[in-house]
């Protein structure tokens, strides 16, 4: 399709590097997290820091590139490096409009995200919406 | 200062391929934005042909798509279009342009290419 | 793909007018609010010039008299008061679908 991607933008204080220039920031008002509509790609990207059982968004935006993982509908995470002892980066890609905004699972740090494995897990009914 | 500068054949034959090669002076190509091809035939309107961004993504308009090709040489800091099986339609001022987001903020002078046996 | 048609085709006015040229879009050039239309200046022989971006961003450079408004499919650029080098060729271009398409072009011409 020609329209172009829009996602969720966020970058954690401290954070190095930035995806900024991989899209253009929307303004969305208030009541929805800061967007960036997509430049090269059609595709989202999200990574959260997992510490013991708390998860906490680093970044969120646009891909560079549309490459494996960014045809998925979702934002389904899966482990990539220890940054530190006990911390885990969990990463996913995919390719909706706003579809980094928040996961419905993180995989244990141990596993490698396969479908059945538990991590911090919203409500019944709700996921985990990063506010931003 | 940032420069762009196309250069190129002013003449092509029908059914060859046109070349055209755009050297960017006074910035980086593989730091950051998209680099583009435009072209106006004689007299009327602009229409964009594709980019190829600083980290390598490629668009291409889909009415050119099956005959353009832009790539890019980072060792001269360059961008090329080739534009293949050409006829007298092709006739243009072609421009290579930077993109800042989606929008054209700095251009080349243009070079005319006629298309003519 | 997404056509831009502007009007009037040609705008014949005298240097201190008020220009106001428009450019309607087939479709929506919003998205979440935020509208992808820009302008462009064209002088015989030359390159494009970038005046306005996303509507009514005036480029850095740009005379304030220059202006851009609209959301949605209708947009004008208004030039306050026309100083001499303001006659030229006046091109909207829209870039939230792809392929990026241009209008046909505004001459403001003098009178």
């Known amino acids: 399709p020609p329209n172009r991607r829009t996602c969720v933008f966020f970058e954690a204080p401290g954070v190095q590097g930035s995806t900024k220039t991989l899209g253009e920031l929307l303004d969305t008002g208030p009541e929805l997290p800061r967007a960036i509509r997509c430049l090269y790609s059609r595709c989202c990207f999200g990574i959260w820091n997992l510490t013991q059982d708390r998860a906490q968004v680093e970044m969120q935006g646009c891909r560079d590139s549309d490459e494996p993982g960014c045809e998925s509908l979702h934002c389904d995470p899966s482990p990539r490096a220890h940054p530190s002892p006990g911390s885990t980066l969990f990463t996913c890609s995919c390719g909706t409009d706003f579809c980094n905004a928040n996961y419905s699972h993180l995989p244990p740090p141990g596993s490698p995200g396969t479908p059945g494995s538990q991590g911090p897990q919203a409500a019944p009914g709700e996921s985990i919406w990063m506010a931003l | 200062q940032l420069q762009l500068q196309e250069s190129g054949p002013g003449l092509v034959k029908p059914s060859e391929t046109l070349s055209l090669t755009c050297t960017v002076s006074?910035?980086?190509?593989?730091?950051?934005?998209?680099w583009n091809w435009i072209r106006q035939p004689p007299g009327k309107g602009l229409e964009w042909i594709g980019y190829?961004?600083?980290?390598?993504?490629?668009s291409y308009n889909p009415s050119l798509k099956s005959r353009v090709t832009i790539s890019v040489d980072t060792s001269k800091n360059q961008f090329s279009l080739k534009l293949s099986s050409v006829t007298a339609a092709d006739t243009a001022v072609y421009y290579c342009?930077?993109?800042?987001?989606?929008?054209?903020?700095?251009w080349g002078q243009g070079t005319l290419v006629t298309v003519s046996s | 793909e997404i056509v831009l048609t502007q009007s009037p085709g040609t705008l014949s006015l005298s240097p201190g007018e008020r220009a106001t040229l428009s450019c309607s879009a087939s479709?929506?050039?919003?998205?979440?609010?935020?509208?992808?239309m820009h302008w462009y200046q064209q002088k015989p022989g030359q390159a494009p010039r970038l005046l306005i971006y996303r509507a009514s961003s005036l480029e850095s450079g740009i005379p304030d008299r220059f202006s851009g408004s609209g959301s949605g499919t209708d947009f004008t650029l208004t030039i306050s008061r026309l100083e001499p080098e303001d006659f030229a060729v006046y091109y909207c271009?829209?870039?939230?679908?792809?392929?990026?398409?241009f209008g046909g072009g505004t001459k403001v011409e003098i009178k």
């Open positions: 271009q829209q870039s939230n679908e792809d392929p990026y398409t």
């Open positions: 190829i961004s600083y980290s390598g993504s490629i």
């Open positions: 479709e929506s050039v919003d998205t979440y609010g935020n509208s992808f």
């Open positions: 006074g910035y980086s190509i593989t730091s950051d934005y998209a």
């Open positions: 342009a930077r993109s800042r987001y989606s929008w054209f903020d700095y």
